[in-house]
Interface confidence: low
């Protein structure tokens, strides 16, 4: 079989920029490094058939199936997909290998299946088979990581039971507060499951896979810090592991730490201590309280005390199922056109929520910030002064929550007019919603001061796009006003706007807009 060409099959993943269906050529896109698909000779097959490793692709992802042929002379080729022939344009790379590509842009269900590539070289004919399927992301999960003590070692293992297998990393920070933000230079990341250095100020473990990233912070009481204005609270669901770290620094080793639950010492096997000397020769002690699987009776005040520091407590609450607590009554806001303003929702939730802000069917990313009192807050400031309905939605594994906001922007009315053979209508979206007057312009009233009250119909309608209100006023045409100029005026506390309409026979109507402040 020495005549057989040396072939290589690769998969190239692209970052999407475009949309199309199978293009049998090279296509300019941003690509990731190629993945070798193996291309092994298929045994017991009639003819020479190579089979590439199966390819799983996310919906809407873009890929290139590529074959590199190391054979002398020219080659010709043909792609076949679902009994249809697709054009094939081989070219040669710098190493003089024949290169054949099939680009699949924005993968859909219809593009999944078997792609057959027939190649004819001067020496031989052969077939290459690619099987492309859509990845079943319905089976995907991303679970919040949790901690376990490593057997016979003073170390923590971080576990996230997720599909596909997640990448686990520890996120460590040794400074206080704001400087421990994710991208801060004070933050150190370690891509490993086991952590031995447990003395840091802030310790988190994060797991990430195709569904995103979830993190769990090691709950810590620092006896050298002033207690918060409200007692720190830790929620857990029945069956989850409990980990609380108590940390204290003292000038020498002459101090000890103890954990108590509701004034009773924790049982042996529910805590372990570690100590080390810091760079300035002070002693750091940490004492972990842990329960491998919590029950309702593990609820209570956990107090860490020291012979040399004021004790501090945390309230651990064990719940049967997760929750989201917040007031869901709708809120209306009225602001000026250039006033700075943010919507905000304050909530208490466990497990941590995923949330979105929505306006006009467009979703915006949602950021959460933990407050000292156990509550979290999400703010939305990116409304660009667009009036309408804004929705905050939050959910976790056990609960969901929705809150509606209405934003009204105070502004002078702007009037638009239209007319038909039988009536004239004016529209305005100013706020507060305007009131209307109609006036007739005649020889007797050249300044259009003669008010029309007959045949006027006002209404308020919801403009669906933004959920904002539009006010309209319609004047039914009567013989008394036909052929005259009429003026509709919308006014509110910020000003008045008018439009003048000539009521004549059907046809295009001239409109003259007046702006009266």
């Amino acid at each position: 079989n020495q005549d057989l060409p040396v072939i290589k099959c690769v998969l190239i993943n692209h970052k999407n920029n475009d949309s199309s269906v199978g293009k049998s050529s090279s296509y300019p896109m941003v690509s990731e490094s190629p993945e070798d698909l193996g291309c092994a000779l298929r045994p017991q097959s009639s003819g020479t058939v190579y089979e590439a490793a199966a390819v799983e692709v996310d919906v809407s992802a873009s890929i290139t199936l590529q074959v590199l042929v190391d054979a002398p002379g020219n080659i010709s080729c043909l792609w076949v997909f679902k009994h249809s022939s697709l054009n094939c344009q081989p070219h040669f790379d710098l190493q003089n290998r024949g290169v054949v590509s099939m680009v699949i842009l924005k993968m859909t269900e219809t593009q999944a299946g078997e792609y057959l590539l027939f190649i004819q070289s001067e020496a031989t004919n052969y077939t290459i088979l690619f099987t492309v399927s859509i990845r079943n992301t319905l089976l995907y999960t991303l679970r919040r990581p949790y901690f376990r003590k490593m057997e016979n070692q003073d170390a923590l293992v971080c576990i996230s039971e997720s599909v596909p297998e997640p990448i686990v990393e520890w996120v460590l920070c040794d400074s206080q507060g704001e400087s421990c933000k994710e991208e801060s230079p004070a933050v150190v990341k370690k891509e490993e499951k086991v952590l031995h250095e447990l003395f840091g100020t802030d310790i988190r473990c994060c797991a990430r896979n195709e569904l995103g990233r979830e993190c769990t912070r090691l709950f810590t009481i620092d006896l050298n810090q002033t207690p918060q204005t409200t007692l720190p609270q830790l929620f857990l669901k029945v069956g989850e592991p409990l980990w609380i770290r108590c940390k204290a620094v003292h000038v020498n080793h002459g101090f000890g730490l103890t954990w108590e639950l509701e004034n009773k010492a924790l049982e042996e096997g529910n805590y372990f201590e570690m100590s080390t000397y810091s760079t300035n020769r002070t002693m750091i002690r940490i004492l972990f309280a842990f329960v491998s699987s919590v029950a309702r009776n593990d609820t209570g005040y956990y107090t860490c005390s020291s012979s040399k520091h004021p004790s501090q407590s945390a309230l651990v609450t064990i719940v049967e199922k997760g929750f989201i607590n917040a007031t869901n009554s709708s809120e209306d806001y009225e602001i000026d056109q250039y006033e700075e303003f943010c919507f905000s929702v304050r909530f208490k939730a466990y497990p941590q929520i995923r949330c979105t802000w929505t306006f006009s069917r467009k979703s915006f990313p949602c950021e959460q910030k933990g407050l000292d009192n156990g509550y979290s807050i999400s703010k939305f400031c990116n409304h660009k002064h667009q009036p309408g309905e804004y929705i905050f939605h939050a959910e976790n594994d056990d609960a969901q929550f929705t809150k509606m906001f209405t934003l009204n922007i105070r502004r002078k009315p702007q009037v638009l007019a239209e007319a038909s053979a039988s009536q004239a209508s004016c529209f305005s979206d100013g706020y507060p919603l305007p009131s209307w007057t109609w006036k007739k312009c005649s020889d007797k009233s050249p300044n259009c001061t003669e008010e029309i009250t007959e045949g006027v119909w006002n209404r308020k309608a919801n403009r669906k796009v933004f959920g904002q209100w539009v006010s309209s006023s319609t004047l039914n045409m009567s013989e008394a006003i036909k052929g005259f100029l009429v003026k509709c005026c919308a006014y509110n506390s910020l000003g008045t706007s008018c439009e003048t309409i000539l009521l004549n026979s059907p046809g295009p109507f001239p409109f003259i807009q007046d702006n009266i402040s």
Epitope: P232, P310, S311, S313
Partner: nanobody, 111 residues
Framework: QVQLQESGGGLVQAGGSLRLSCAAS????????MNWYRQAPGKQRESVAW???????NYADSVQGRFTISRDNAKNTVYLQMDNLKPEDTAVYYC?????WGQGTQVTVSS
């Protein structure tokens, strides 16, 4: 919900004494630790002393031997007896327990 109310602060000359009281709205007998903190202008809030339900006490080095903390569970009150006061003891003194803070009482020591 525990509410704490401090009293007894005031202006005193160096070397003088004051007795601060912290009255709790509910029973403190089940509360294990009662604390006094203080905050001087422009400084962090710091621990001064604490007392456990069994009566054991602990003091910051700077007040050791001059201040005495005590509690009366029947009256739901904690006390801080401050003797031989120094100008550096000038601060707002706060009572604290289990996540609850009082409003604070001002102590000013003049030289």
């Amino acid at each position: 919900q525990v509410q704490l109310q401090e009293s007894g602060g005031g202006l005193v000359q160096a070397g003088g004494s004051l007795r601060l009281s912290c009255a709790a709205s509910g029973s403190i007998s089940s509360i294990r630790y009662m604390n006094w903190y203080r905050q001087a202008p422009g400084k962090q809030r710091e621990s001064v002393a604490w007392i456990t339900s069994s009566g054991s006490t602990n003091y910051a080095d700077s007040v050791q031997g001059r201040f005495t903390i005590s509690r009366d569970n029947a009256k739901n009150t904690v006390y801080l007896q401050m003797d031989n006061l120094k100008p550096e003891d000038t601060a707002v003194y706060y009572c604290y327990t289990m996540g609850y803070w009082g409003q604070g009482t001002q102590v000013t020591v003049s030289s």
